[in-house]
Interface confidence: low
């Protein structure tokens, strides 16, 4: 339904508070280096303009598209050329090319300072002095560091952030109340950002069909009692929501997400028995709850899949009549029966089924040709099962930190050209699969582990795309979305890699390491481990373990010394010499 003024329509639908928050997020995700005050000024100008359009939809410029209005506003930033370089060239383009240009310049790894958390009293004072500015600053800082963060979900995080400060700043022990809540929000936020980044990569790099296939599989697992037509409707609507958010259309995205939540709750009887509690919550909580809702129970009387998809003589006829609908039905039927499979595995099975039908429906005897198609699924199912079993055993044996180290070594040997910070970040996240998923029973391990690994490997892919250094990473990232994990798993030591020159400076440490948190200290040690492997890719596990044990002892010893800096200087030289000898550097 066309509106005379799109900006007035969205302002009325969303309300002033959400409108302003979403415009701030949109601007911060596009112009990631701009100061907070500049963004607030732009948002206020847009909001005042929107109000004039609400009062009179025929007023000047009110008929312009949101991209035109927002793009024009962004292009008024005086320092665009010196701050953003070639991004300023976007402003010479017309819509829709201008928006596409801004999207292409979003930076997954912006050169911004790490967010340092002030003292609790300082934060509480700032919160009480100006709550509105304090919360806007939160939106701004998250959005500019995570340019694909799911905007309506960020509003939910901001609501929780506000609630944490409201409660804890009047508690007897403010820090004990607030810090765990902030830690939880930070960790959940990073996870949410990474999950959304995969959705956007799926849409942008592999197209709408790939995203819809993912959504069919996931929603069919979650809502196995829903009819195929119902799942298809939800998939279409969900695809629209994520296409809008990934495309920077945050007002439309938030509005459509609210409509989808409303539809789901109005039709929960035909969707899932698990939605009741979610649907009693306010809007932001409701949408979040629906997105995280547990899988409904499978209907008890589901017939064998083989009847419709293998034994039927009409398989090729049904396939030819509407290929994507037939494949969608196959995926729906398979997924609703298999909450124990990862979404990516279900998509691999569907792809194998599609490939088989493509060749068999052109053969002389199609039925004989595709009769054994389900046999081809067995190795595809066993491969992730075996991999998860092996890695969970290793995780249980080593614990998270040492398991991360094993993955650090494994991935550095596979793709040693990748930057050390990226290898550390990605391997640490890969290693978290252990604590996250290995505690689950068998039936929940694979969907937990493999779908989580897809999210983490996408981080590697988007970071690598910014500065490509490895053909192997490019190949695994671009050839097939659903086969990324098997592709990386299949990589072995890169025999073409020329080891890095030894640089003693890389292994020189100072007393400041003693004041770091346990997590930061681990990152320092893991950074050194990656550098060691880059110098000596053929080093054995035993050699690397010996060096890392010596390193841990060295840090512990010097952090206990009276003259820490001298200890680090003198003992550090000995450690470097001993490590060189041990590894034959």
């Amino acid at each position: 339904d066309a509106h005379k003024s799109e900006v007035a329509h969205r302002f009325k639908d969303l309300g002033e508070e959400n409108f302003k928050a979403l415009v701030l997020i949109a601007f911060a995700q596009y112009l990631q280096q701009c100061p907070f005050e500049d963004h607030v000024k732009l948002v206020n100008e847009v909001t005042e303009f929107a109000k004039t359009c609400v009062a009179d939809e025929s007023a000047e410029n009110c008929d312009k598209s949101l991209h035109t209005l927002f793009g024009d506003k962004l292009c008024t930033v005086a320092t665009l050329r010196e701050t953003y370089g070639e991004m300023a060239d976007c402003c010479a383009k017309q819509e829709p090319e201008r928006n596409e240009c801004f999207l292409q310049h979003k930076d997954d790894n912006p050169n911004l300072p790490r967010l340092v958390r002030p003292e609790v009293d300082v934060m509480c004072t700032a919160f009480h002095d100006n709550e509105e500015t304090f919360l806007k600053k939160y939106l701004y800082e998250i959005a500019r560091r995570h340019p694909y963060f799911y905007a309506p979900e960020l509003l939910f995080f901001a609501k929780r952030y506000k609630a944490a400060f409201t409660e804890c700043c009047q508690a007897a022990d403010k820090a004990a109340c607030l810090l765990p809540k902030l830690d939880e929000l930070r960790d959940e936020g990073k996870a949410s950002s990474a999950k959304q980044r995969l959705k956007c990569a799926s849409l942008q790099k592999f197209g709408e069909r790939a995203f819809k296939a993912w959504a069919v599989a996931r929603l069919s697992q979650r809502f196995p009692k829903a009819e195929f037509a119902e799942v298809s409707k939800l998939v279409t609507d969900l695809t629209k929501v994520h296409t809008e958010c990934c495309h920077g259309d945050l007002l439309e995205c938030a509005d459509d997400r609210a409509d989808l939540a409303k539809y789901i709750c109005e039709n929960q009887d035909s969707i899932s028995s698990k939605l009741k509690e979610c649907c009693e919550k306010p809007l932001l909580e409701k949408s979040h709850c629906i997105a995280e809702v547990e899988n409904d129970e499978m209907p008890a009387d589901l017939p064998s899949l083989a009847a419709d998809f293998v034994e039927s003589k009409d398989v090729c006829k049904n396939y030819a009549e509407a290929k994507d609908v037939f494949l969608g039905m196959f995926l729906y039927e398979y997924a609703r029966r298999h909450p124990d499979y990862s979404v990516v595995l279900l998509l691999r099975l569907a792809k194998t089924y599609e490939t088989t039908l493509e060749k068999c429906c052109a053969a002389a005897d199609p039925h004989e040709c595709y009769a054994k198609v389900f046999d081809e699924f067995k190795p595809l199912v066993e491969e992730p099962q075996n991999l998860i079993k092996q890695n969970c055993e290793l995780f249980e044996q080593l614990g998270e930190y040492k398991f991360q180290n094993a993955l650090l070594v494994r991935y550095t040997k596979k793709v040693p050209q990748v930057s050390t910070p990226t290898l550390v970040e990605v391997s640490r996240n890969l290693g978290k699969v252990g604590s996250k998923c290995c505690k689950h029973p068998e039936a929940k391990r694979m969907p937990c582990a493999e779908d989580y690994l897809s999210v983490v490997l996408n981080q590697l892919c988007v970071l690598h795309e910014k500065t490509p250094v490895s053909d192997r990473v490019t190949k695994c990232c671009t050839e097939s979305l659903v086969n990324r994990r098997p592709c990386f798993s299949a990589l072995e030591v890169d025999e073409t890699y020329v080891p890095k020159e030894f640089n003693a400076e890389t292994f020189t440490f100072h007393a400041d390491i003693c004041t770091l948190s346990e997590k930061e200290r681990q990152i320092k040690k893991q950074t050194a481990l990656v550098e060691l492997v880059k110098h000596k890719p053929k080093a054995t596990k035993e050699q690397l373990k010996a060096v890392m044990d010596d390193f841990a002892a060295f840090v512990e010893k010097c952090c206990k010394a009276d003259d820490k800096e001298t200890c680090f200087a003198e003992e550090g030289k000995k450690l470097v010499a001993a490590s060189q000898a041990a590894l034959g550097l």
Partner: nanobody, 116 residues
């Protein structure tokens, strides 16, 4: 560029044996799982067997289990298929392919005919 060249096919009597080879070049062979697929006259492609990149895990279609053995030599960038107890229904063009069971062949293939 990626090249897969199959060889070793021929005419053999039922119960006989053949060893197929696939010489790979233009990609990091040691980094990828490999498969054999076949196409009988007038039929579609049928997956035969797969092996992981290191050679430690192997998979077979039920129709060849116990008769065929897949292996690889990463130092020679070569994939093998040892075929024993051949039957008339094994007659087909055999192709090697990069990847697991769903992999698509890109080479010319090698003809295997089992006939008395």
């Amino acid at each position: 560029q990626v090249q897969l060249v199959e060889s070793g096919g021929g005419v053999v009597q039922p119960g006989g044996s053949l060893r197929l080879s696939c010489a790979a070049s233009g990609f990091a062979f040691r980094g990828f799982g490999m498969s054999w697929v076949r196409q009988a006259p007038g039929k579609g492609f049928e997956w035969v067997s797969s092996i992981n990149n290191g050679g430690s895990d192997t998979y077979y279609a039920d129709s060849v289990k116990g008769r065929f053995t897949i292996s690889r030599d990463n130092s020679k960038n070569t994939l093998y298929l040892q075929m024993n107890s051949l039957r008339a229904e094994d007659t087909a063009v055999y192709y090697c392919a990069i990847g697991g069971p769903g992999a698509s062949p890109s080479g010319q293939g090698t003809q295997v005919t089992v006939s008395s």
